[in-house]
């Protein structure tokens, strides 16, 4: 048993059929010695008397808010949550496996630049009785500070019969060094509590591996005289790290016809302009990637040829 | 060339070669099914590689103030990786394919280190750890880890030279 926060405790339960459970001793936080009784949740059934209460935690029915009283007055509370191991594996029931980039990916994180700021998000089908708390650090043995905000509901989607809820959190490394080569990964830890179930999820990454620039901005076309060619120009996104002579991007320019089946013409360039042939009803799209490290491409920025 | 006394390197040549190094490092080890090498344990194997750290002066301001600290650090790293790529980790079993970019990568690391330091001038180099994995599968894993680490190192080096070529070239 360990303390999650004041008066909230997590019992680690290795469950299997006929498992004996965990013996837990609760102590009433009071100087009083006599006349103390214990109840669970809203029930008035007295579970025991005395300053301490010993319980055998075998299942969720044994978890909840234990209260000690004296003469009708509440003395203290202890909320017991269960962290369950089933078949030797800690439960991961609260969050949905996003399966990208690999199985058992519950948390996904992205950074728009090298400033040490990043966003993580996760999915659940649970709509009520749900709380999250997020902690992060650079490295684990001698951790350096990363400050995370509160997790917030950022999107709701309908998936078949189910509603899916997306939560996200923003974190910022306290002493970020954008130009350095990372040697210790960022660790992100999410505590999730649904009803009386506690679960924790972790992700470990280098900022360089989660970089995804915003799309190029100010995408413009300039027709070239007496030609079907156009000069496409764009700018670095505002959110990208500066100076651009140091934090450089590379770009992919694509000409795509109306039909998805039509052949796509692609040009790769380090410049912020390119000359392409504009076909009727086609569109021109540009996306960006770190020039020197193959992290994710940005989403496309697009303009119609006409 | 970074000649004794701290004159400037051939920024543009260094830029071109470092960008080529980035391309080669990624073609030598693309993201194989997002294999997370940090989950594979034995951290000590790649913990000893020289990293370009915050105080090494490789940021734009540090380069403007005195690029020599940073160039020395990059040189150290290039020599370190050049030795690793020439060691039995890469020469032993399982043999690399004849068209593997590792050979080109090895030559380019040497080329860039020579651009930074001419014969007769010696910056101190970091001791290469004695990593001699016995099993071919351990060797393979170590190759992946070294190449992943090299990708991060050459990315920073390439940024340094690109910025130097754009802002510090005479």
């Amino acid at each position: 048993i360990w303390e999650l926060k004041k008066d909230v405790y997590v019992v680690e339960l290795d469950w299997y059929p006929d498992a004996p459970g965990e013996m837990v001793v609760l102590t009433c936080d009071t100087p009083e010695e006599d006349g103390i009784t214990w109840t669970l949740d809203q029930s008035s059934e007295v579970l025991g008397s005395g300053k301490t209460l010993t319980i055998q935690v075998k299942e969720f029915g044994d978890a909840g808010q234990y209260t000690c009283h004296k003469g009708g007055e509440v003395l203290s509370h202890s909320l017991l949550l269960l962290h369950k191991k089933e078949d030797g594996i800690w439960s991961t029931d609260i969050l949905k496996d996003q399966k990208e980039p690999k199985n058992k990916t519950f948390l996904r994180c992205e950074a728009k630049n090298y400033s040490g700021r990043f966003t993580c998000w996760w999915l659940t089908t649970i709509s009520t009785d749900l709380t999250f708390s997020v902690k992060s650090s650079r490295g684990s043995s001698d951790p350096q500070g990363v400050t995370c905000g509160a997790a917030t509901l950022s999107a709701e989607r309908v998936r078949g019969d189910n509603k899916e809820y997306e939560y996200s959190v923003e974190c910022q490394e306290d002493s970020a060094c954008p130009a350095a080569e990372e040697s210790l990964p960022i660790e992100v830890m999410v505590d999730a509590v649904h009803k009386l179930k506690y679960e924790n999820y972790t992700s470990s990454f280098f900022i360089r591996d989660i970089i995804k620039p915003d799309p190029p901005k100010n995408l413009q076309l300039k027709p070239l005289k007496n030609s079907r060619q156009v000069e496409v120009s764009w700018e670095y996104p505002d959110t990208w790290s500066t100076p651009h002579s140091y934090f450089s991007l590379t770009f992919c320019v694509q000409v795509q016809g109306k039909s998805k089946r039509e052949k796509k013409d692609r040009v790769f360039t380090d410049k912020t302009s390119a000359t392409v042939i504009c076909r009727k009803n086609a569109s021109i799209s540009v996306r960006a990637q770190d020039r020197y490290y193959s992290s994710s491409w940005s989403e496309w920025a697009s303009v119609p040829c006409s | 060339r970074a000649v004794p006394g701290g004159s400037s390197p051939a920024w543009t040549q260094c830029q071109q070669l470092s960008q080529k190094l980035c391309t080669l490092a990624w073609s030598a080890h693309p993201l194989v099914g997002h294999m997370d090498l940090r989950e594979e344990g034995d951290e000590e194997t790649t913990n000893d590689v020289p990293h370009i750290q915050c105080g090494d002066g490789c940021d734009p301001q540090g380069l403007r103030d005195n690029s020599q600290f940073c160039l020395q650090r990059i040189h150290q790293g290039l020599i370190f990786y050049e030795k690793l790529l020439g060691s039995d980790i890469f020469t032993g079993e399982p043999s690399l394919l004849p068209d593997s970019p590792v050979g080109q990568l090895h030559a380019s690391l040497l080329g860039l280190s020579q651009l930074l330091q001419p014969e007769g001038h010696h910056w101190e180099t970091q001791q290469i750890p004695s990593l001699s994995p016995s099993q071919p599968w351990q060797r393979l894993l170590l190759r992946f880890k070294i190449l992943r680490s090299l990708q991060a190192f050459v990315a920073v080096a390439a940024r340094v030279f690109a910025h130097g070529a754009a802002t510090l070239s005479p």
Partner: nanobody
Amino acid sequence: EVQLVESGGGLVQAGGSLRLSCAASGRTFSGYDMGWFRQAPGKEREFVAQISRHNSNTYYADAVKGRFTISRDNAKNTVSLQMNSLKPEDTAVYYCAIGSLFPSSRERDYDYWGQGTQVTVSS
């Protein structure tokens, strides 16, 4: 919204068998733990059995252990309770319930309930 419909109840002699079924609709059934409860006349509703969402681990009340078997078919969105060696004290209305806490014998840990099916065991 989730709907649960029980079937398979009836009158049976002591020592006999019955198989109860519960069909779920309205949400992805595989994401829930499933349970059966029962309520005998004049008594409180009590836990019978539960099956987990993932690996079909099972949890039983002591009174039915060895006689009842709970199973589920995620493809068909059903959960079944095979009741053997029935006793007169097994007479009750049997309710199917789903929740998200396994193992739990506590009523309030279940989110959705069926209307119930009557099982009568005569001596």
